[in-house]
Amino acid sequence: TQNKALPENVKYGIVLDAGSSHTSLYIYKWPAEKENDTGVVHQVEECRVKGPGISKFVQKVNEIGIYLTDCMERAREVIPRSQHQETPVYLGATAGMRLLRMESEELADRVLDVVERSLSNYPFDFQGARIITGQEEGAYGWITINYLLGKFSQKTRWFSIVPYETNNQETFGALDLGGASTQVTFVPQNATSESPANALAFRLYGKDYNVYTHSFLCYGKDQALWQKLAKDIQVASNEILRDPCFHPGYKKVVNVSDLYKTPCTKRFEMTLPFQQFEIQGIGNYQQCHQSILELFNTSYCPYSQCAFNGIFLPPLQGDFGAFSAFYFVMKFLNLTSEKVSQEKVTEMMKKFCAQPWEEIKTSYAGVKEKYLSEYCFSGTYILSLLLQGYHFTADSWEHIHFIGKIQGSDAGWTLGYMLNLTNMIPAEQPLSTPLSHSTYV
C-alpha cells in the first residue's frame, strides 16, 4: 500500500479570452498546497472556439450557446468531475466588446447576458463575464509573462529556465497585439509618471512595482487595417484602391458599409460615390509603411515624450516580451529568432510583400486566404508600430523577444487575470520557500 499513488491535490481554473476576432478557453492547474508560490500555475489546455469574436453575435445572440459548447465540453473532459463545482470560470472580453459598447451599450450588455446564461449551465463555478479595461489587459499581460519567467521569485538562479531569461530580477515589459487594440506595459527607469492615467502601482511578493501601461483602442491589427482602408479610400479617384499593403495581383471587393461599421473609422468617414470598392494589391513595403504612419498622429504631445495621438510614453527600458498577434504574425513570417536584426526583418518584409499573390497562395496552400492575404499588412504594421509608434530602434529591437508560450503556458492576459481573481499573487513574500531546488531538476 505504501507505493500506492496518492490522489493529486490540485486545483483548476478556466479563463475565456473573448477577443475581437475569436474566443479562446484556457485551463490552468496548480498544486493546492502551493497556491501562493510563484510560477506554480501552468496551462494544461487551450481550446480555440470555432467562429468569430462574441461581438459578432450581436444580431444572432441565440447562437452563442452552441458557439461555446465544444470548448466548454472539452473543459468538462479535462478537469476531473469531482473538481467541477470548485473550478472557477471567468470570461473577459477585450477591445472588440469595448468597441461594441461604444456603439451600443445595450447590445453589448445583451451579448454578455447571453454569454453568462450559457456559461451558467455548466457544472463549474461561473464567476461572470465582463469587459476588461485596456489598462487591465496590459497589466495582466505583464503579470503573466513575469510570473512565468520567474521574475517575482526572490531566488536568483545561476541558470536559466527559459531561453531568453536573464538571471537578474528585472521584469520584462509586455507588448500585446490583438485584433482591435494593442497594449504596452513596462517598468520605466523613472518611477514618477507625468500621466497618472498610465501609472499602476503593484506590490507583489514583497516588492513594489511602478508600472506604465497604455492600451491603444483601434490599433489592433484588424482595426488598424480598417482605419488604413478608410483613410486611403478618401483620396481614391474611383472605386479602385491600389494598395501597397497587399501582394501584387491580389484583388478583393470591400463594402463601404462594412468599412464604416466600426467606430475606429469614424474619423475618416465620408460620403463616397460608390457602395463598394476593389482593393488591388501592388505589394510595396515602403509605401505600405508610409501609409500606416499616417494613422499615428505624432505632431501633438503634451508630455516630455509621447507614443502617438498625444499619449505619454516614457523612455523604453529593459527587455520586452511581444506576444499574441506580435508573435503569431512574426512566427508565420519566420522572424521570431533572436538573431534576426531589425534591418533583416525590414528586408524580409520588403521581399515578402513584393511576392505575387499567386506565388504566395502556392507557397502557403494550407493557409486560409483571408489570413494569408493580410500578413504583408500585419508584418509592416508591427514594424511601424514598434519603431515609429513605440520608438524602438535598431539597437533596442534586440531587446524584443517574440514569445508564444513560456514553459507551456501562453503569453497573454488570461493567466494574470486568473491569478489576481483567485488571490494567488500575494502582496508579501510567502514565508515558505517558493520552490525547492529539486523542482527545477
Epitope: E105, L112, D113, R117, S120, G128, R130, I131, T133
Partner: antibody, heavy 121, light 107 residues
C-alpha cells in the same frame, strides 16, 4: 426575463428603521449594479444610492449618508436597503432599479414594482 | 450636485400632436450620461432614452432624444393615448439626479 421583486408595504413609527428587499432573477446577479430611488406621494424621483453586488461596495447620495445601508446576499440574489431614524417625510414608494455593468453608463434599465413605506405615529 | 430643470411643468396636448419636453442642466453634462423615463400613475418608471438620443429596447420610434451640454430635449412626434404620463430626465455625474418631471396631459 429580468425581474426585480420587492418586499411588501411597511408601516413604521418615527425613529424606527425599515429594511426593504429586492430579489433579482433572469440574469447574473453579480454583473449589474443595483440602485435605490424613492418617490414621495405626488413628488418626483429621488436617488438614494447604489450597490455593486459583486463586491458589496456602496455609494450613497449625500442626503442619506449615515442613515441608509445597502447590502446584498449573493446566495439568494437579493439586495436590501435599510433606512434608519425614520421621519414622516420618509413616507414614499421605494424602488430598486437595475443599473449598469461595470464600465457602462448610469441609467436605470429595469425597475422593481415599488414598496410603499409609511411613517406615521 | 447638478440640478436638472424640466419645462414646462405640464403640457396639455391632443393625441396626434407633437410634444417637445425640455431638460436644462445647471452645468454641462456628457451626452452619454443623460436619460429619459416615462412614469404612469401607480407604475414604476420606464427607461425610454439613454445616452441622450438612444432608444431603449422596445421603445417606439416616435420617441426621440437630442441635445448636448446643458440643453436636452425629448420629442414625441405624434402622441398616442398611452403616451400621456409624467416624463423625467436623469443625469449622472458622480451622483444621479432627476429633473422635477413634465406631465403630458390630454387637452
Amino acid at each position: 426575463q429580468v425581474q426585480l421583486v420587492q418586499s411588501g408595504a411597511e408601516v413604521k413609527k418615527p425613529g424606527a428603521s425599515v429594511k426593504v428587499s429586492c430579489k433579482a432573477s433572469g440574469y447574473t446577479f453579480k454583473s449589474y449594479e443595483m440602485h435605490w430611488v424613492r418617490q414621495a406621494p405626488g413628488q418626483g424621483l429621488e436617488w438614494m444610492g447604489r450597490i455593486n453586488p459583486s463586491v458589496g461596495s456602496t455609494w450613497y447620495a449625500q442626503k442619506f449618508q449615515g442613515r441608509v445601508t445597502m447590502t446584498r446576499d449573493t446566495s439568494t440574489s437579493t439586495v436590501y436597503m435599510e433606512l434608519s431614524s425614520l421621519r414622516s417625510e420618509d413616507t414614499a414608494v421605494y424602488y430598486c432599479a437595475r443599473g449598469k455593468r461595470e464600465g457602462g453608463t448610469e441609467y436605470l434599465r429595469k425597475w422593481g414594482q415599488g414598496t410603499l413605506v409609511t411613517v406615521s405615529s | 450636485e447638478i440640478v436638472l430643470t424640466q419645462s414646462p411643468g405640464t403640457l396639455s396636448l391632443s393625441p396626434g400632436e407633437r410634444a417637445t419636453l425640455s431638460c436644462r442642466a445647471s452645468q454641462s453634462v456628457a451626452s452619454s450620461y443623460l436619460a429619459w423615463y416615462q412614469q404612469k400613475p401607480g407604475q414604476a418608471p420606464r427607461l425610454l432614452i439613454y445616452g441622450a438620443s438612444n432608444r431603449h429596447t422596445g421603445i417606439p420610434d416616435r420617441f426621440s432624444g437630442s441635445g448636448s451640454g446643458t440643453d436636452f430635449t425629448l420629442t414625441i412626434s405624434r402622441l398616442e393615448p398611452e403616451d400621456f404620463a409624467v416624463y423625467y430626465c436623469q443625469q449622472y455625474h458622480n451622483a444621479i439626479t432627476f429633473g422635477g418631471g413634465t406631465k403630458v396631459e390630454i387637452k
